[in-house]
């Protein structure tokens, strides 16, 4: 058939690889778009075809699998570069088809240059380590499938530009890097260089990740509302602006959703008729603890508004808390001639 299910350009899978290194790229069809795997497709008589569009070109062309030393090859649903070149950058398409069925997807591949300190435009994965939490490890990522288990590669770890050896609390252990006790000073970029032989040639795989030391779960507490509190009274006259900040501290918790909200007389501000605005800002500490501030603002407060209950609520995976603001109407200063004179028995 002429028709082909075209999944378009899958920009979610922006693949970046280093120049002059091996790269193995799986066809995304089987991972994200189709309900069957390559083996099933192959046994059903479907063929996987690869082609590409060079950077800044519109013309789709077949991939040349007849380059010297099989620089580009295909194995099952994997496209191999041994190694990549800078001008391999472009959009790659894998198409699965037979006479009655067709499905294809394209994805961008960017070949990236790095300097001698492993700096590059590569987007780095972030690995979070808990502060002072005992031994934690990071593993050299995305090296599976490059060499058989019978091959024993050499692995060298770097922090920034420096080879990791005789570091106080960081120990290389093959594919793993162990942090005996993670500290803020361990924040930074870590690179593993994996060197392995293949068919008389030596290849290098460079993998860099960012280590971020974050708050430990053993130190985590439920949200702490710093404001409103019992020490502050919002005393206003009708017509004045009422500004009440709700400031909440959240301990870092992996995958926790931190929420702050106001209620006025038990209702969300959206559900009442007062002209109220809420502005939020968020700041983070070095260990990714979070301080959220929501400022509730009523431009011209009425005497009715000053009788309402204003409660700040906060929630995280550690629990939920709430605190009411102390709001009251300012008592006008007495006018001497009338009020005080009456007090002295004047008539």
């Amino acid at each position: 058939s002429e028709r082909c299910d075209d999944w378009g350009l899958d920009t979610m899978r922006q693949i970046q690889v280093f120049e002059d290194e091996p790269a193995r790229i799986k066809c995304p069809l089987f991972e994200h778009f189709l309900k069957f795997n390559y083996s099933t497709a192959h046994s059903a008589g479907l063929t996987l075809i690869w082609y590409w569009t060079r950077q800044d070109r519109d013309l789709e062309e077949p991939i040349n699998f007849r380059l010297p030393e099989n620089r580009i090859s295909k194995e099952k649903d994997v496209l191999w570069f041994r190694p990549t070149l800078l001008n391999d950058t472009g959009n790659y398409t894998c198409m699965l088809r037979n006479t009655t069925y067709c499905s294809k997807v394209a994805f961008p591949l960017e070949v990236v240059q790095k300097d001698s300190c492993f700096n590059s435009p590569m987007k780095l994965p972030v690995h979070k380590l808990y502060i002072e939490y005992g031994i934690q490890r990071i593993t050299c990522p995305n090296v599976d499938g490059y060499f058989p288990s019978s091959v024993k590669p050499t692995i060298t770890w770097y922090m920034g530009c420096y080879k990791i050896q005789n570091f106080n609390n960081v120990i290389p252990e093959g594919m793993n890097l162990s942090f005996l006790i993670a500290l803020i000073s361990n924040n930074g970029n870590y690179t593993c260089v994996v060197t392995y032989p293949e068919n008389g040639r030596t290849f290098h795989l460079t993998r860099t990740l960012t280590v971020k030391v974050v708050g430990s779960p053993k130190n985590a507490v439920p949200p702490v509302i710093h404001s409103p509190n019992d020490h502050v009274v919002y005393e206003k006259e009708p017509g004045e602006e009422l500004l009440i900040p709700c400031t909440v501290y959240f301990s870092f918790l992996m995958d926790s959703r931190n929420e702050v909200w106001w209620t006025i007389d038990g209702k969300k501000p959206d559900d009442i008729t007062i002209d109220v605005t809420i502005n939020e800002s968020i700041s983070h500490s070095r260990t990714e603890d979070e301080t959220r501030t929501q400022i509730l603002s009523i431009k011209k407060v009425t005497s009715e508004d000053l009788k309402r209950s204003y409660v700040c609520h906060a929630r995280s995976a550690k629990g939920e808390v709430a605190k009411a603001a102390k709001v009251k109407q300012k008592v006008p200063a007495p006018r001497y001639t009338v009020e005080l004179a009456c007090g002295f028995g004047a008539t």
Epitope: H226, H231, T293
Partner: antibody, heavy 123, light 112 residues
């Protein structure tokens, strides 16, 4: 970044008043307590009082009660400290200092300080 | 009012050695899970700088040679190894229960 910039040095006569300002920037001004701390020449630090800009709520050290007034102008993110009935022992550098927020519900530290304002009381 | 007593009043140590400053409160400044005691460094002609908050938590950007410990009424600031730029006066500070903050009398650190 957080900055606290104070007004310049003042020379006052005994019995007069002085008003020192502290302009804040780099954070949400109304949400942090602002403290005033003074330091007489060659002496230690002495807490004068504090103000919460969102509400104007103030707390003063017992020693300064009745002589000190702290005010705020939220439109310019500035706090003021006025000390009246000055005497020679009020000669000191006066610092404004912001209270921090942390995982605990009180007992706050002073995380940012102004550069200080020297107030000299002399006849 | 809680009174904070710092000792010694002055301290001279060799470069690279340990300096230990102690601060005693007239009553406990600790509660469930934290102590409301902080340490500041003040160099000549400069405002104080927060070093350690809540007895032992190092403030952002402060070198790890500074450490704090203690709870209840007895607290310690350690500097190890002491460096030339650590010459300063060190103050303990408690903020137990708004609205009263007090400071210790200060400890002057010098290099031998």
């Amino acid at each position: 970044q957080v900055q606290l910039v104070q007004s310049g040095a003042e020379v006052k006569k005994p019995g007069a008043s002085v008003k020192v300002s502290c302009k804040a920037s780099g954070y949400i001004f109304i949400t942090y307590w602002m403290n005033w701390v003074r330091q007489a020449p060659g002496q230690g630090l002495e807490w004068v009082g504090q103000i919460f800009p969102a509400s104007g709520t103030t707390y003063y050290a017992q020693k300064f009660q009745g002589r000190v007034t702290m005010t705020v102008d939220t439109s310019t993110s500035t706090v003021y400290m006025e000390l009246s009935s000055l005497r020679s022992e009020d000669t000191a550098v006066y610092y404004c200092a912001r209270t921090d927020f942390y995982r605990y519900d009180g007992g706050y530290a002073l995380d940012y300080w102004g550069q200080g304002t020297l107030v000299t009381v002399s006849s | 009012d809680i009174v904070l007593t710092q000792s010694p009043i002055s301290l001279a140590v060799f470069l690279g050695q340990r300096a230990t400053i102690s601060c005693r409160a007239s009553q406990s400044v600790s509660t469930s899970g934290y102590s409301s005691m902080h340490w500041y460094q003040q160099k000549a002609g400069q405002p104080p700088k927060l070093l350690i908050k809540y007895a032992s938590d190092l403030e952002s950007g402060v070198p790890v040679r500074f450490s704090g410990s203690g709870s209840g009424t007895d607290f310690i600031l350690n500097i190890h190894p002491v460096e030339v730029e650590d010459i300063a006066t060190y103050y303990c500070h408690h903020s137990w229960g708004i609205p009263m903050y007090t400071f210790g009398g200060g400890t002057k650190l010098e290099i031998k």
